[in-house]
């Protein structure tokens, strides 16, 4: 168990007297003090809180902290000229405008600076034209239209739900099927649960609650004009023409009020299916076009927002390690948000706060960890995690050598049902064995652990008795250290019955009624999830920063690889005729698969039996530890995405929020029927199933006896 | 506590004007659209004018469109109804009533009412 | 212009159940509200929404909705219930309407 020779508390007490020392009623204290006014990115606001935080965290005890800047490229309405959307009648005459800005909720009526919902970095433009509605404007959905339903969208509006995927691919998609704008807006079906009141009367979406957020399709790059370095005070920029991700099209969020009154007179084709159909009073019709009495009506959007590069600020807290100082455990959230932030990302945020809290009153009693733990508030995360992105880059060449693990702390909770566990399968032992050690806070168990509440509500959809633990995809700050850097990565927080509510997030997610009153009275009075979330996260860090061992096992990596090997070998087989005529072979992959769980078994059998004492031998045994998630990562980066270099996990290319696993050898063969030239598409499988037999069979060697 | 308390009205000539004013008290204002409704003696009720919360639209009955024009200020927490080119069917109680913005929760709070008469 | 059209009276005995039909051809795109109002008072929301109820609003009252017809059901009619009730609804226009008004008496 944890231990650690630089400490005056027992070393089986350590774990304990840092979970003791974390207090509910500190994390409501900070949820409060963090969401009174609100943090948007690059403003004074979120500057003044930047340095609150640095303060606090100082008197907390860390070593030092320390504000990193970066100049990027952030995307702002105008406040003169709002953006809205109007249905026009033959004369020009706008007939009916969406919203300015949402009903302020009670008690918040007289804050200034609240961004009025719009999507950040959508080009300026006044298109007009008629509407196709295009469900989640996922991959699927345009197949529908245009394979199926043969329906163009180009030259036209469309308007998609918000919903199942990252709102950055809608637009993608979007653009790629010729739309020359894009409305988003929340459908009760997706964001209103049955039987509860909308805010401020209950946790539901109303009608005039709108969801921001950036359009961006990054593909892990950071500031959209620094690709691959840091915004510092001497960098190049891009031109805006060659920056990274930005949409061509615009794009405006609107509520299911406004979505209704364009709806309603939707014509042309009847929805293909019923799944087409969200929980509006109206026909779902696809269109193109209003039906006949308003088929001379158009849709025209009206979009100022100005794209402009903004001073962002990073908080960097050290807590220098007694042993390994040289290695870094890192614990980073983000801090900016879109309002006030009471879910996102401040329920995060004051967990962070009150870990660093307790890691602080351990250190002025004479404790240390073994390995140093760096402590990280994130700026701009909003705007395609740019903060993060940025020091990173700024200090990859130390993260790459030094980076032991990246946990992250964004929101705290998205429901109170159960928890929910996305990390590297290098992890899964020390989540499991942390989770029997905590208490559940659920109702119907007390005296229980929370690994038994958790599997109970979440079980494994593979081994019984095991709680479910998902893939990292991305729209988080552990994008650029998992998926660009190769540094064990994992997140943790409170989640709702994904069974019985079928919406997507939660309903008020990055609107202006994320308040702290969302979240005090509705989700979580006690503050009890925070604070099992606190004891995840934070003990999770201290595991990670003061086990002799390293809490990683290498095993659970095999098991997932033969796993996901077999999945897209049964994907790849659906093509069986073409497997055959072009030698498509996953013999090589198997083969490395198998290597690799001879070899951590192996590894694993050392483990268990090298002489601790030896620091050389302790140093050497953890290095290969931390650097198997290394292992993985290709230089090269996969096709078109350089800034995703891990081969075994990626976001998906159709949901950025999804991991998707063997991305390389998944995309070769996605839609592969369609391919114009079939041998060059099958070509490209088999080189990418090449490119992950190689890595895996390499991964499996850095495990092997060094000598 | 919430309260909406109409004035302005009174006994007009055919073709002159009035205003009638709204005064809103016990809620938030700007997150409210606002309407007025009338109701003819011994007749039903008829709505008449709606305005958002955020001033981003106003609509009319057909039967006052080009005559009358909605208006508020929010500083004074006051919805307005300038009634021009008055017409006996103008003659009625006239109502305001506030009803949440961009939502579907109804015109839950209503004033007491204001009569307008117009007779020569 | 658009109408929504209801029955100008309904009788019924004390603890028996009231119907109040309101037709309109935007209801199945739109949603209905019901209004109570007393001689000499202002009208008060009864119905939201089609089917919602307003705190406040005893549970003998609801609503529902089908097609081109919403309907406001009072179970258990109590003497206090005698009253006119409005039904409202918009257009595709953004203009609102109400219906023609149902008198409802309890015998």
């Known amino acids: 168990k944890s231990s650690n020779e630089a400490t005056n508390i027992t070393p089986k007490h350590n774990m304990k007297a840092f979970l003791d020392e974390l207090k509910a009623e500190n994390i409501k204290k900070f949820l409060y003090n963090f969401t009174q006014i609100p943090h948007l990115a690059g403003t004074e606001q979120n500057f003044q809180l930047a340095k609150q935080i640095q303060s606090q965290w100082k008197e907390f005890g860390l070593d030092s902290v320390e504000l990193a800047h970066y100049d990027v490229l952030l995307s702002y309405p105008n406040k003169t000229h709002p953006n809205y959307i109007s249905i026009i009648n033959e004369d020009g005459n706008e007939i009916f405008n969406t919203s300015l800005f949402e009903p302020p909720p009670p008690g918040y009526e007289n804050v200034s600076d609240i961004v009025p919902p719009f999507s950040a970095f959508s080009p300026q433009g006044m298109p007009e034209g008629d509407l196709v509605y295009v469900n989640y404007a996922r991959t699927e959905d345009f197949f529908k239209l245009e394979r199926d339903m043969k329906i163009n969208c180009s030259g036209k509006i469309v308007i998609a739900r918000y919903g199942k995927v990252f709102r950055g691919n809608k637009v993608k998609n979007a653009q790629l099927a010729g739309a020359k704008g894009v409305i988003l807006y929340s459908d009760p079906a997706d964001y209103f649960a049955p039987g509860v009141k909308s805010y401020p009367d209950g946790w539901n979406l109303p009608g005039g609650g709108v969801q921001r957020g950036n359009i961006l399709n990054l593909n892990g790059a950071g500031d959209p004009l620094t690709p691959g370095y840091p915004a510092n005070e001497y960098a190049y920029r891009r031109g805006i023409a060659e920056a990274v991700g930005l949409p061509s099209i615009p794009v405006h969020p609107i509520g299911y009020y406004d979505a209704q009154k364009l709806l309603e007179k939707m014509g042309g084709s009847a929805p293909p299916d019923s799944s087409w159909r969200g929980s509006l009073k109206v026909p779902y019709n696809v269109g193109p076009g209003f039906t006949g009495n308003f088929s001379t009506q158009k849709v025209k959007m009206h979009i100022h927002s100005t794209n402009e590069v903004t001073r962002i600020y990073n908080v960097i807290g050290t807590l220098r390690g007694a042993v390994e100082p040289d290695r870094y455990v890192i614990l980073g959230g983000h801090r900016d948000s879109w309002v006030f932030g009471g879910i996102d990302p401040q329920s995060g945020a004051a967990v962070v706060h009150e870990i660093v809290r307790s890691f602080g009153t351990l250190k002025k009693e004479g404790w240390r960890p073994r390995r140093t733990i760096l402590f990280a508030s994130w700026d701009a995360e909003e705007f395609g995690l740019l903060g993060s992105t940025e020091w990173a880059e700024e200090n990859s060449r130390l993260l790459q050598e030094r980076g032991v693990a990246y946990i992250n702390a964004d929101s705290s909770i998205e429901g109170n049902y159960t928890l929910r566990v996305d990390c590297t399968p290098l992890m899964y032992s020390l989540v499991h064995n942390l989770t029997k050690e905590l208490k559940s806070p659920d109702e119907g168990f007390e005296g229980k652990s929370l690994y038994e509440s958790w599997t109970k509500k979440s079980p494994s959809p593979e081994f019984s008795g095991m709680p479910r633990i998902s893939k990292l995809g991305s729209g988080n700050d552990f994008e650029v250290f998992f998926q660009r850097l190769g540094i064990a990565s994992g997140r943790a927080r409170y989640t709702k019955n994904w069974e019985t509510n079928k919406f997507s997030g939660y309903p008020l997610y990055h609107s202006v009624y994320e308040t702290y009153e969302l979240v005090e009275k509705f989700y979580d009075p006690m503050f009890k999830y925070h604070l099992t979330v606190a004891q995840v996260r934070g003990g999770m860090v201290f595991e990670l920063a003061n086990s002799i061992v390293l809490p990683f096992d290498c095993r659970d990596y095999a098991v997932v690889l033969r796993k996901y090997a077999d999945k897209i070998y049964s994907i790849s087989m659906k093509h069986p005729q073409e497997m055959k005529t072009y030698s498509v072979s996953f013999d090589s992959l198997f083969s490395a698969v198998k290597n690799f769980t001879e070899i951590a078994s192996k590894f694993s059998e050392r483990l268990q039996d090298f002489d601790k004492s030896n620091p050389i031998v302790l140093r050497m045994m953890n290095d290969q530890l931390m650097f198997l998630e290394r292992a993985f990562i290709d230089p090269l980066g996969l096709p078109d995405r350089p800034f995703y270099r891990h081969v075994i996990y990626a976001p998906s290319s159709h949901n950025k929020y999804a991991g998707e696993s063997f991305p390389g050898i998944y995309d070769a063969l996605f839609d592969i029927e369609s391919k114009v030239d079939p041998s060059k598409a099958w070509g490209e499988v088999k080189r990418q199933i090449y490119v992950a037999a190689f890595t895996v069979q390499a991964a499996a060697e850095t495990l092997s006896e060094v000598a | 506590q919430v309260q909406l308390v109409e004035s302005g009205g009174g006994v007009v000539q055919p073709g002159r004007s009035l205003r009638l004013s709204c005064a809103a008290s016990g809620f938030t204002f700007s997150s409210y659209n606002m309407n007025w409704v009338r109701q003819a003696p011994g007749k039903g009720l008829e709505w008449v004018a709606i305005i958002y919360y955020d001033g981003s639209n106003k609509y009319y009955a057909d039967s006052v469109k080009g005559r009358f024009t909605i208006s508020r200020d929010i500083s004074k927490n006051t919805l307005y109804l300038q009634m021009n080119s008055l017409r006996a069917e103008d003659t009625a109680v006239y109502y305001c009533?506030?009803?949440?913005?961009?939502?579907?929760?109804?015109?839950?709070?209503w004033g007491q009412g204001t009569t307008v008469t117009v007779s020569s | 212009s658009y109408e929504l059209m209801q029955p100008p009276s309904v009788s019924v005995s004390p603890g028996q159940t009231a119907r109040i039909t309101c037709s309109g051809d935007?209801?199945?795109?739109?949603?209905a509200y019901w209004y109570q109002q007393k001689p000499g008072q202002a009208p008060v929301l009864v119905i939201y929404k089609d089917s919602e109820r307003p705190s406040g609003i005893p549970v003998r009252f609801s609503g529902s909705s089908s097609g081109t017809t919403v309907t406001l059901t009072i179970t258990g009619v109590q003497a206090e219930d005698e009253a006119d009730y409005y039904c409202q609804s918009a257009d595709s226009s953004g203009t609102y309407v109400f219906g023609t008004g149902t008198k409802v008496t309890v015998l």
């Open positions: 009533a506030r009803e949440r913005g961009r939502d579907y929760y109804g015109m839950d709070v």
């Open positions: 935007a209801l199945p795109k739109q949603y």
